[in-house]
């Protein structure tokens, strides 16, 4: 089956949510760990990210069809020391499958705002941090 | 276990330097923004620096800018303040702290090297 | 830069009262987080994001407010709740701001 792995983001407030999704058939959800990096090139793994998700095989989901799994990792206030560029990763322990999605960064500017860009899917977001809307 | 030991405290002269370390463990070290945070005898808490997980962007108070240096070496799970031209207002004992990677609070804290600037 | 002023300075509490303080920024902020810090050791993250509970915190302990009005509430005072206890923020550019401590004895 195709197996792909995409980045995103949203805001809520002044929260951040950063997403990570896997999409997968069923059977193919047991032995699969998604994990989110920062600032690793070269040695993004479940042992070295921010947060990784372990997925189970959910057999109350009927058919063969392809079905999405997600990470999210929440960053409620958006500081400069969150600067820098994050990757979604994905493993399975089974097939050893391992899947690398876009590299994306978030960018604090002066202004006291940031930016998260490299995103796919139109998502290129610029946020205000104190009013907390989408600019 | 989450462990950090400073050390590298002592009695100093105003106007000398002095370097504290802090030796992390138990968690996956760079991964996480570290900072210093200092307590004057019998007084608050006030945070002196930061730093991002890489080591490569710092942040200060006004009032230690230029005179204190934070870093970190990740290979060996240390972090380190370079104190120079200390003050007697300096004068704390200073605590070596993780940054919580979702929130803005210091989830983690040392025990505290105390450092005295006095002639 | 914002002042996070706290009230009261020192106060004491019997056991079984009900304690509040309360912590008020200079301009408003998003979240306040709590510590608790007791004679001779390091302060321990209490409460964060105004109002969730650290890892074994006892739910006596509440956490309330927004804007520029926060307060931390223990329901029903025990010996063990005598400690000082702080208020911080984050804000840009003045990074992190704590108050200056709230001293709770033990009446």
């Known amino acids: 089956g195709c197996i792909n792995i995409t980045s995103s983001a949203s805001q809520e407030g002044t929260r951040l949510n950063l997403i990570c999704t896997v999409w997968h058939k069923k059977e193919e959800a047991e032995g699969f760990v998604v994990f989110l990096c920062k600032d690793r090139s070269g040695d993004c793994s479940p042992e070295t990210s921010l947060k990784q998700l372990r997925l189970k095989r959910d057999p109350g989901i009927d058919g063969v069809g392809e079905i999405s799994s997600q990470l999210m990792f929440t960053i409620s206030q958006v500081t400069p020391l969150h600067s820098g560029t994050y990757q979604c990763c994905a493993r399975s322990q089974k097939s050893g499958i391992r899947l690398q999605g876009h590299f994306f960064s978030i960018l604090f500017t002066e202004t006291g705002n940031y930016t998260v860009t490299g995103l796919k899917q139109r998502q290129h977001l610029e946020f205000s941090h104190n009013e907390g809307t989408l600019s | 276990e989450v462990q950090l030991v400073e050390s590298g405290g002592g009695f100093v002269q105003p106007g000398r330097s002095l370097k504290l370390s802090c030796a992390a463990s138990g968690f996956t070290f760079s991964n996480y923004a570290m900072a210093w945070v200092r307590q004057a005898p019998t007084k608050g808490l006030e945070w002196v620096a930061s730093?991002?997980?890489?080591?490569?962007?710092?942040y200060y108070r006004d009032s230690v800018k230029g005179r204190f240096t934070i870093s970190r070496d990740n290979a060996k799970n240390t972090q380190y303040l370079q104190m120079d031209s200390l003050r007697s207002e300096d004068t704390a004992t200073y605590y070596c702290a993780t940054h919580n990677y979702g929130s803005t609070i210091f989830d983690y804290w040392g025990q505290g090297a105390m450092v005295t600037v006095s002639s | 830069e914002i002042i996070l002023t706290q009230s009261p300075t020192t106060m004491t509490a019997s056991p079984g009262e009900k304690v509040t303080i309360t912590c008020r920024a200079s301009?408003?902020?998003?979240?306040m987080h709590w510590y608790q810090q007791k004679p001779g050791a390091s302060p321990k993250p209490w409460i964060y994001?105004?109002?969730k509970l650290a890892s074994g915190v006892p739910d006596r302990f509440s956490g309330s407010g927004s804007g520029t009005s926060y307060s931390l509430t223990i329901n029903n005072m025990e010996a063990e709740d005598a400690a000082t206890y702080y208020c911080?923020?984050?804000?840009?550019?003045?990074?992190?701001?704590f108050g200056a401590g709230t001293k709770l004895e033990l009446k």
């Open positions: 730093i991002n997980s890489g080591g490569g962007d710092s």
């Open positions: 994001e105004t109002s």
């Open positions: 911080q923020q984050w804000n840009y550019p003045s990074m992190y701001t």
């Open positions: 301009s408003s902020v998003s979240y």
